[in-house]
């Protein structure tokens, strides 16, 4: 059997026998274009492609449409994988989305969506989610039905107020909605009563800015 040399996601890497968490090179579907991603091979059976991570505020998430499209940051630390890659990947097969959250009091929670995909750039990378389970709230903190993606230079939300400029970060803002995992990072003891922080309302309420977040995807049939 010929050894697979290109991988479209971390699940393929895991199944090839590479089962250590770390940075791997992925290839865009139907292309030779490559992208580096962090693969979590430990959580829930492994094979997770990390598409977003926050942990310390070291990376500025108030970025342009182009930067969110192509990705930014470091896969070893805080980063955004890139809307274009995620859109292409999730448009080919059915993926689940797991969101892991940490607060400043030592608690952890997660939300799991059993079907996740991003529409293409022509639809502003609109998010589609179904089948919520998990411990981070019984109601989805990502507004349903899914919103278009907005950044500081591309306002596609449902509010006249330009949510990305007001709240910081690119996100699937509604008007503006119950979440923003790409908001301003606030350190401990400065993380409450913040309108523009890292927010997941149906777990921690409004004004609470989280300590750490990870968004990761994996094929539903893994």
């Amino acid at each position: 059997k010929e050894e697979q040399t290109t991988f479209r996601d971390c699940a393929e890497i895991f199944k090839s026998g590479l089962t250590t968490s770390g940075i791997y090179t992925l290839t865009f579907p139907n292309s030779t274009e490559e992208i580096k991603a962090y693969c979590d091979m430990d959580v829930g059976g492994g094979g997770w492609t990390v598409i977003q991570h926050r942990e310390d505020g070291s990376v500025d998430f108030q970025r342009t449409w182009k930067e969110y499209k192509e990705g930014f940051g470091s896969p070893l630390g805080e980063y955004w994988l890139g809307n274009e890659f995620v859109s292409q990947l999730t448009g080919q097969h059915r993926y689940v989305l797991k969101i892991q959250l940490k607060d400043w009091e030592g608690n952890e929670a997660h939300s799991l969506y059993d079907h996740f995909y991003l529409a293409g750039e022509e639809s502003n990378y609109r998010i589609h989610l179904t089948g919520l389970t998990g411990t981070a709230g019984k109601i989805s903190s990502i507004s349903q039905p899914g919103s278009d993606f907005s950044t500081k230079d591309s306002d596609n939300d449902k509010c006249i107020c330009k949510c990305s400029q007001m709240l910081s970060g690119g996100w699937w803002f509604d008007a503006c909605g119950p979440s923003n995992l790409n908001g301003q990072y606030y350190p401990q003891k400065q993380n409450t009563n913040k309108f523009n922080g890292i927010k997941w309302y149906y777990w921690k309420g409004s004004g609470y800015s989280l300590k750490a977040t990870t968004m990761m995807i994996r094929p539903a049939d893994f």
Epitope: K158, C159, I160, M166, F195
Partner: nanobody
Framework: EVQLVESGGGLVQAGGSLRLSCAAS????????IGWFRQAPGKEREGVSC????????TYADSVKGRFTVSSDNAKNTVYLQMNSLKPEDTAVYYC????????????????????????WGQGTQVTVSS
Amino acid sequence: EVQLVESGGGLVQAGGSLRLSCAASGFTLDDYAIGWFRQAPGKEREGVSCISSSDGSTTYADSVKGRFTVSSDNAKNTVYLQMNSLKPEDTAVYYCAAGLRGRYYRGTYSLVCAPYEYDFWGQGTQVTVSS
């Protein structure tokens, strides 16, 4: 420091009235939208009525339209909720909260009145409506 203090709650018979007050300090009403929200046991917190003092716009939940009236007194930095024709289903803890002004739905220009858009909260006041 932003502070919101609610008062005026209590026990009232169905059909009666109450007037809730929300005294704000640490900011001026013109800079924020103020919302009244309520939470009944075992239920999610819900928007009742919101007001933006800077332009006078208001919004109401369908369940209270025609019965509740929100108003503000900028000189006293206080927002009021006049509640008439109260029903047992209005029983809840009522909270006032402040959020950034300027949040209006595109197209309808109606003020957003969802609890997740409001970041500073009071401690709440209990309203009980007996039948």
